[in-house]
Amino acid sequence: VPRWRQQWSGPGTTKRFPETVLARCVKYTEIHPEMRHVDCQSVWDAFKGAFISKHPCNITEEDYQPLMKLGTQTVPCNKILLWSRIKDLAHQFTQVQRDMFTLEDTLLGYLADDLTWCGEFNTSKINYQSCPDWRKDCSNNPVSVFWKTVSRRFAEAACDVVHVMLNGSRSKIFDKNSTFGSVEVHNLQPEKVQTLEAWVIHGGREDSRDLCQDPTIKELESIISKRNIQFSCKNIYRPDKFLQCVKNPEDSSCTSEI
C-alpha cells in the first residue's frame, strides 16, 4: 500500500539532487585552490543532514550549521556584489570582473543555485514530488532557510564598499520582501561597511530616466542611512554595453554618446 504523502504547493526536489550537489562540489573545489581541502562527501552528508527526516516546514538555521562550518570560505570582503531580481546579469558581471563575488560564486551558493530540495518527517526519503512554497505553505522550508542563512552570513562578512545590482524594470526596484531587502540590508555591519552602492539596471533601450530617484530607492537610502552606512546610486542604462566596457574601457564604443 503506497504511503500517504504530504502534497505541497511548490515543485519537488530537483531530479538527481544528491548527484548534482556532489558533482558541483567536486567541480568547485577543483577550480578554486583555496577550497581544495574540502571533503565533498562530508559536505553532502552535512547538506543532507540539514533536511532529511525533518518536517519541511520546521527547518531552522541551526540545522544548516554543520554545512556552514564545512563551507566556510573567505572572499575579499570589499569585493562583494549583492543582487535582487537580476541574478543572471550579476553573474555575467562577476564572470567579467573576476575580482568581485556574488553569493553564488562561493561554494555554498554555487552548490544550491537554482536547486529545490526537501525531505519528509521521520523518513529518510527525499521528496521529488513537491516541496513547500514560501507563500502558500510555510517560510521555514529547507530552501528558504538555506538562502536566508547563507545570505545573512555573506552580508555580515562584507566590508568597505558593498555593491548591489537592482532591477530597474520591476515595479519595486527595491523590494523590502526580497532576500536583499529582508536579510542582507539588515545584516551589513556599519562598523565595517562604509558605503552601499546601488546599480539600477535599466531594461528599456530608450529609458534614460534617473531611476535613482525612484521612491523605493529613496526608501533603501533611508534604511541604509539610519544604519549609519553611506548610500550611493548609479543608473546603468545599457547593461549589455556596460559589461563590454568593464571588460574593455578603451573600446571607442564605450566613449561615444549614442
Epitope: Q97, D99, V161, E197, S208, C212, S232, K234, N235, I236, Y237, R238, K241, F242, C245, V246, P249, E250, C254, T255, S256, E257, I258
Partner: nanobody
C-alpha cells in the same frame, strides 16, 4: 564622503591650450577610474576623456571629438586627474565636470559615473 574639486577653466582663443585639474578627497583614488565630461550650452552632458585605475593599467580613453587634441593623465600621489586641452576649438566651449567611479567611466548613454565634481567653465572664442 567623496569630494571632487575641478579647476583650471577660463577663456582662450581658438588654437590655444588650457589644463584642467581635479583633486579627489575622502578616498584614495589610485584604483578608481577618473575623468572628464562636459556640457555645452543647450546640449546634453557628454563624455570627454577618462583614465582607468591602477589595477587596469591607468589607460586613457577619449571621445572621438577630442582624440589627438586632449590628453588625460593622473597623479595618484596627489589624487589628481588632469585634462590637457590643446588646439582648442569654439565647439569645445562648455562646463567641464570631473567624475570618478570605482569601476569604469563610460558614455552617459551607457552608465552614470559613481561621483560627480562641480564644473569649471571653458570658453573658446574664434
Amino acid at each position: 564622503d567623496v569630494q571632487l574639486q575641478a579647476s583650471g577653466g577660463g577663456s582662450v582663443q581658438e588654437g590655444e591650450s588650457l589644463k584642467l585639474s581635479c583633486v579627489g578627497s575622502g578616498r584614495t583614488f589610485s584604483d578608481w577610474a577618473m575623468g572628464w565630461y562636459r556640457q555645452a550650452p543647450g546640449k546634453d552632458r557628454e563624455f570627454v576623456a577618462a583614465v582607468s585605475g591602477a589595477g587596469r593599467g591607468g589607460k586613457p580613453s577619449y571621445a572621438n571629438s577630442v582624440k589627438g587634441r586632449f590628453t588625460v593623465s593622473r597623479d595618484n600621489a596627489k589624487n589628481t586627474v588632469y585634462l590637457q586641452m590643446d588646439n582648442l576649438k569654439p565647439e569645445d566651449t562648455a562646463v567641464y565636470y570631473c567624475a570618478a567611479d570605482r569601476l569604469v567611466l563610460v558614455a552617459l548613454s551607457i552608465a552614470d559615473p559613481g561621483f560627480w565634481g562641480q564644473g569649471t567653465r571653458v570658453t573658446v572664442s574664434s
